[in-house]
């Protein structure tokens, strides 16, 4: 349960996260399991520990083995194991199965291929993408943040996709590649003009001054995976991020659910420590996709607090 396989190619950077999480963690110590020898934290070393992360800059075949991480806190020490294998670079184009990350599926409407493990690295856009070793070119392919988007996906788009990026550590650059298979599934989906399920139009939401309040904007957009669909909140017609009130935040990321086969999204607006002035604002739940935009407006009203313990 607390062991994780990691792999990489020689002369590339490899960064491994400790499979145990601290709750909380104060320090993390790393050891070579075979020798119980501590891994240094000084960055001048080719292999060094940096908190939850173990860094091979760059990796060598001889680094293969099991590494122990101990997440320390006053209450508990939690032990995890990272099983690291470093492979020699292949001279031919084929990527062997043991170097492949999990397969992802896509369809005409959803063709995102995420670059595996990239979140562990200090990288800057753009990513380079290859399919079966050929650099991807043409307007159908768009490298966006940490993923590749393929427009108008066809069955011929199935194959092995490799992302390549540069990890920067203290001014030194290291190459990283990661490969995963992409399969195309035929999806009989459709999209509709957005339908907002909550809140109701012109809904009045009762809140208590000084307490926290949550507003959920929930909308459905059709059947199957939707390529372009979003829900968001606006305050007095302004984006939450531009409104500049730190107490009022949208929940990061949109939750996707499938209700009766319908593709739905919801976004929670969290208002901390509700103030009188919040009652004067207009809260707009917006749902938009390729068909257009729908808006439902909510206002807050004061609820008389019932005396109770927290």
């Amino acid at each position: 349960k607390f062991s994780k396989q990691s792999w990489g190619l020689e002369n590339e950077a490899l960064i491994v996260r400790c499979p145990r999480q601290g709750k909380p963690s104060y320090t993390v110590d790393w050891y070579y399991s075979q020798t119980n020898k501590s891994i240094p934290t000084q960055e001048r070393n080719r292999v060094f520990a940096s908190g939850q992360l173990l860094k091979f800059l760059p990796a060598a075949v001889a680094d293969s083995g099991i590494y122990t991480c101990i997440v320390r806190s006053p209450t508990f020490n939690r032990t995890g194991y990272a099983n690291v294998t470093i492979y020699k670079k292949q001279s031919d184009c084929n990527v062997p199965d043991y170097l492949m990350y999990s397969t992802v599926s896509g369809s005409e409407k959803n063709s995102k291929i995420y670059c595996p493990t990239i979140d562990l690295y200090n990288w800057t856009a753009p990513l380079e993408w290859f399919k079966n070793c050929q650099a991807l070119q043409g307007s159908r392919y768009r490298a966006h943040k940490s993923f590749l988007v393929i427009d108008n996906v066809m069955t011929e788009d199935a194959g092995d996709y490799t992302c390549k990026f540069i990890h920067n550590e203290n001014g030194a650059n290291y190459s990283v590649t990661a490969t995963r298979s992409f399969t195309v599934k035929d999806e009989q989906g459709f999209s509709l003009f957005p339908v907002i399920g909550a809140p109701a139009q012109n809904e009045i939401k009762e809140v208590e001054i000084g307490k926290n309040a949550n507003l959920t904007c929930s909308a459905c957009f059709g059947k199957g995976t939707q390529f372009l669909a979003a829900v968001l909140w606006q305050l007095n017609g302004t984006k939450i991020t531009d409104f500049g009130e730190p107490r009022i935040q949208q929940e990061e990321g949109q939750n996707q659910s499938f209700s009766n086969g319908l593709a739905c999204l919801d976004m929670v607006l969290r208002i901390a420590d509700v103030k009188e002035e919040d009652l004067l604002l207009q809260y707009d739940c917006l749902a938009l996709n390729l068909h257009g935009l729908r808006r439902h407006t909510v206002r807050l009203s004061r609820k008389n607090p019932i005396d109770h313990h927290s």
Epitope: K23, P24, Y26, T27, P74, T75, F76, R78
Partner: antibody
């Protein structure tokens, strides 16, 4: 909003045992440690111990070893504290409190009042 | 055990003015990782304690920025810049550096 719902007030006889419960909602109980704290007018807030619900590992204050036993049930998202060989000194309000990613005592239950009286 | 020392009652303050209270630990709460494991909690009358400040100077989620905290390894101060009626209660400092975790005896904030 993370909630910790504690069991109701208890009145028990000296020498008896009692089990207090703390039900976690809106998060997975195995994700964070659960701590228990005692509060009395005389001694204020005292840390009793903690449990890691993921593994069942426990840590206790020396003052409460043999007095408190901490357990957790993942299926019901509930943490328990059993107090044994009760005396009037054990009369107090007991709180459960969960840790967060970066710190302890992030949120607290509403407290359970325990009265030990003959 | 690390002993946390607080004054029992702060000087009564007027609403809208600032208030401060101190806390002292019997051992430095500065960890080798660079973090100072000093915490402040507020317990309002009839309620559970609630986290205000973690790791000496970080404001917990939802806590107004009227609250701030500073200190060295052993001496700490909690400051409330504009006291409101809802700030009334007992303020506890606590250490999470090592077991057993310990709390101060609390400082009661009173309004004039």
């Amino acid at each position: 909003q993370v909630q910790l719902q504690q069991s109701g007030a208890e009145v028990v006889r000296p020498g008896a045992s009692v089990t207090l419960s703390c039900k976690a909602s809106d998060y997975t109980i195995t994700d964070y440690e659960m701590h228990w704290v005692k509060q009395t007018p005389v001694h204020g807030l005292e840390w009793i111990g903690a449990i890691d619900p993921e593994t069942g590992d426990t840590a206790y204050s020396q003052n409460f070893k043999g007095k408190a036993t901490l357990t957790a049930d993942e299926s019901s998202s509930t943490a328990y504290m059993e107090l044994s060989s009760l005396t009037s000194e054990d009369s107090a309000v007991y709180y459960c409190s969960r840790s967060a990613t970066d710190y302890y005592f992030a949120s607290w239950g509403q407290g359970t009042t325990l009265t030990v009286s003959s | 055990d690390i002993v946390m020392t607080q004054a029992a009652i702060s000087n009564p303050v007027t609403l809208g003015t600032s208030a401060s209270m101190s806390c002292r630990s019997s051992k430095s709460l500065l960890h080798s990782n660079g973090i100072t494991y000093l915490y402040w909690y507020l317990q309002k009358p009839g309620h559970s304690p609630q986290l205000l400040i973690y790791q000496m100077s970080n404001l917990a989620s939802g806590v107004p920025d009227r609250f701030s905290s500073s200190g060295s390894g052993t001496d700490f101060t909690l400051k409330i810049s504009r006291v409101e009626a809802e700030d009334v209660g007992v303020y506890y400092c606590a250490q999470n550096l090592e077991l057993p975790f310990t709390f101060g005896s609390g400082t009661k904030l009173e309004i004039k």
